[in-house]
Interface confidence: low
């Protein structure tokens, strides 16, 4: 014959355990069941009666089954630095991620507690490591041979430019100006060109170009596969 | 008030290893790497590594072999272990803040632990 | 590996004196730095990116330089500048000191 099933509340064989979505009262000493997520223990179950339960109060959520007696309190608002990505319903928290272009400096299990803006690489200098949404932005001057002329969060060092004749030598802040005769090469439009590393995880550095040769721009990236994105570091 | 403090075990036996750690206060290990460098009177000063913002560390290809640097941002320390020790790597070991905002300056130093490397 | 020398590796100066040492790179670099070290003390911050006086070092120091040739300027040399100087780059790994200019008062 086919085992009986049990209704809660009902007193668990010695040794076993309850079943999915109960708990063991051990004032009534009964398996009771929980209550669904978004929902609360309203009240707590007898030798004859079970779990009542009753919904969450405004900004206030459970996520899983319980059988808890209130619910938990949402966070609190998002604050200016930060968007809000999951909103706060009976089963859920409110999230809180940092906006674009700032990075989450304390996260807390879910979201962010804290954020801070990306750096910004001031000219001299580009971006060695891009931020993420946990970490900032890293800066590296730029070696001879690349420069970057802006302060910002998204420009790495670039090659200067290769005159036939150089009016005035390219430094780490400036690119080389040419006489009035075009360029044998400049940056092409939209091209990426992926910063010199100031100094490679594991790895020798090939001796650093003199400005007037052209820039090698093949090296090992120091944070791996992924090409940086461009430069940043805030002030 | 930013600082760095060094702890080390002052007196290594040779081939064993280093342990040393930078406790810093004043700023957090998630905005600032910290570098390692020692000074001994044959060598004067010898960077050895760092430790970025970010988590990965940087070494100096004479020590990448036997030189791991890692951290735990939440109790503000940052470890320096170096192993296989021999006389020569006697010295006075600093820690000391990276700026990694741009000016890219060593701008805070620990005072240094002394290491003697001897039987 | 950039080596840096500096030169002289030792001198003395007199109170008021105009003081000037050298850092000279074996390849070109994009910026220097220097320390200042007196002795039982941690190296200090003393001028970066070339030219920039780091915190509360006096304006009679001055930095120059570029390439593969640096230079530190005291105008007017005072007691309290008797010290080891340093040079330090980091255009390319590893980064590299000099090995130092000892500066003393006559």
């Known amino acids: 014959l086919p085992a009986q099933v049990a209704f809660t509340p009902y007193a668990p064989e010695p040794g076993s355990t309850c079943r999915l979505r109960e708990y063991y009262d051990q004032t009534a000493q009964m398996c009771c069941s929980k209550c669904s997520p978004g929902q609360h223990a309203k009240v707590f179950c007898t030798k004859t009666s079970d779990t009542v339960c009753d919904s969450c109060e405004d900004s206030t959520y459970t996520q899983l089954w319980n059988w808890v007696p209130e619910c938990l309190s949402c966070g609190s608002r998002c604050s200016s630095d930060q968007v809000e990505t999951q909103a706060c319903t009976r089963e859920q928290n409110r999230i809180c991620t940092c906006r674009p272009g700032w990075y989450c400096a304390l996260s807390k299990q879910e979201g962010c507690r804290l954020c801070a803006p990306l750096r910004k690489c001031r000219p001299g200098f580009g971006v060695a490591r891009p931020g993420t949404e946990t970490s900032d932005v890293v800066c590296k001057p730029c070696a001879p041979g690349t420069f970057s002329n802006t302060t910002s969060s998204t420009d790495i060092c670039r090659p200067h430019q290769i005159c036939n004749v150089v009016a005035i030598p390219g430094n780490a802040s400036m690119d080389a100006v040419c006489t009035s005769t075009s360029p044998t090469r400049s940056m092409a439009p939209g091209a990426v060109h992926l910063p010199q590393p100031v100094s490679t995880r594991s790895q020798h550095t090939q001796p650093t170009p003199e400005p007037s040769t052209a820039p090698s721009t093949s090296f090992l990236l120091p944070m791996g596969p992924s090409p940086p994105a461009e430069g940043s570091t805030g002030d | 008030e930013v600082q760095l403090q060094e702890s080390g075990p002052g007196l290594v036996q040779p081939s064993q290893s280093l342990s040393i750690t930078c406790t810093v206060s004043g700023f957090s290990l998630t905005s600032y790497g910290v570098h390692w460098v020692r000074q001994s009177p044959g060598k004067g000063l010898e960077w050895l590594g760092l430790?970025?913002?970010?988590?990965?560390?940087d070494y100096s290809a004479a020590f990448i072999s036997r030189l791991s640097i890692n951290k735990d941002n939440s109790k503000s320390q940052v470890f320096f272990k170096m192993n296989s020790l021999q006389a020569d790597d006697t010295a006075i070991y600093y820690c000391a803040r990276n700026d990694d905002g741009g000016d890219y300056v060593m701008d805070y130093w620990g005072q240094g632990t002394t290491v003697t490397v001897s039987s | 590996e950039i080596v840096l020398t500096q030169s002289p590796a030792l001198m003395s100066a007199s109170p008021g004196e105009k003081v000037t040492m050298t850092c000279s790179a074996s390849s070109s670099v994009s910026y220097m730095y220097w320390y200042q070290q007196k002795p039982r003390s941690s190296p200090k911050p003393w001028i970066y990116l070339t030219s920039n006086l780091a915190s509360g070092v006096p304006a009679r120091f001055s930095g120059s330089g570029s390439g593969t040739s640096y230079s530190l300027t005291i105008s007017s040399m005072e007691a309290e500048d008797a010290a080891t100087y340093y040079c330090?780059?980091?255009?390319?790994?590893?980064?590299?000191f000099g090995a130092g200019t000892k500066l003393e008062i006559k």
């Open positions: 330090q780059q980091w255009t390319s790994n590893p980064l590299t």
């Open positions: 430790i970025w913002s970010d988590g990965s560390p």
